[in-house]
């Protein structure tokens, strides 16, 4: 019998304020964690610009599958949704409806950081359970795509600096694959 993926209604979350499921506590092995070992959080734009850019984060809860196996518990995933761009839009002739500047840069809402969560997978027919680490989106950001550039040339909106391992980073704290966003979009 096939496993049916389950999801709840999407809930819009204000970027940066979303609740993320915490992985279960692991062995208490903190002795060898780098004193200043986290990747610093990435701020895609300056604080003064926050109100001028829109990037939606949607939460979905569903069971994950790996072949015939299904996660023992549903997992809450984050999907970056919608277009984002400057709020300062040119007025049209009527002067009421805002519209995009035709030759301006295109802004996309894409994953910023990823995190890993341990998932126990139960398999049918008495097969042994599996343990996997799933790559989940932790946060979204606006990236600029200039129309004259290749699709893959997404540019960060705001400066991208070198990331030495300075300052512990609170969860969620990792990023992952380009491929993942497409999989999530296809999942719903």
């Amino acid at each position: 019998q096939g496993w049916q993926a389950f999801r709840n209604d999407a809930t819009e979350v204000i970027p940066g304020l979303g609740e993320y499921p915490e992985p279960p506590p692991e062995n208490n092995q903190t002795m060898n964690r780098a004193e200043n070992g986290g990747r610093p959080p990435h701020h895609p734009y300056d604080a003064k610009d926050v109100s001028e850019y829109s990037c939606r984060e949607l939460h979905y809860t569903r069971f994950l599958t790996d072949g015939p196996c299904r996660s023992a518990k549903p997992v809450t995933e984050l999907v970056c949704s919608g277009q984002c761009g400057p709020a300062r839009l040119l007025p049209n002739a009527i002067g009421r409806v805002k519209w995009w500047r035709p030759n301006g840069p295109d802004f996309r809402c894409i994953p910023d950081r990823y995190r890993a969560q341990r998932v126990q997978l139960l398999c049918p027919g008495g097969a042994a359970p599996r343990s996997r680490k799933v790559r989940l989106v932790a946060s979204c950001k606006c990236k600029r795509l200039t129309r004259f550039h290749n699709q893959s040339e997404l540019k960060d909106f705001g400066p991208e600096t070198a990331r030495p391992q300075k300052g512990r980073k609170p969860r969620p704290g990792a990023r992952g694959a380009k491929a993942n966003q497409a999989e999530l979009e296809n999942a719903y």
Partner: antibody, heavy 121, light 109 residues
Amino acid sequence: EVQLVQSGAEVKKPGASVKVSCKVSGYTLTELSMHWVRQAPGKGLEWMGGFDPEDGETIYAQKFQGRVTMTEDTSTDTAYMELSSLRSEDTAVYYCATDSAGYWYKFFQHWGQGTLVTVSS
Amino acid sequence: QAVVTQEPSLTVSPGGTVTLTCGSSTGAVTIDHYPYWFQQKPGQAPRTLISDTDDKHSWTPARFSGSLLGGKAALTLSGAQPEDEAEYYCLLDYGGTFVFGGGTKLTVL
């Protein structure tokens, strides 16, 4: 496809430091979980440390605590591993290794070609 | 720190079957150690054969399989080929800290 290209061989004196680089292509460094592994001549593999995406922290093997620093420059998609207070037993090939950037985390899927570091007076 | 143990060396006949094991000083190896298996030939970087106990990769020959066996991680090679002669390493995940085994030198004679 993830590809990793490491810096060239180094010869260092005891007490000095070495910084090995690992340039990522195919994906950006921030999309991957980078680890460093070394192998002394005729010996086995030894995990030195790497980025743990569960905690968002870099974890170092106890043996190297205080001597190793792993950093990243996302503007060039280059990871660095710096080992200080070198001694002769640090002579080894140093590898960077990363995950496959898939939906399920699979670490150590892609490896650099290795960088030989020789510590000799 | 945990110690991961492997057989130092094993020999298999061409076409034969051999099982390499990987134990942990902390107790039984489980799926939550996400056992990895690597193959390394002289002068080459390692390459992953198995991840997460039993997950093969696109480049992993079908004759290799991973499992848990009697509290250890196991790599079974069925129908050994001369090109399988290499060093094999297992790797265990201890909550984000990884430890390699000492390696098994597999000879195909």
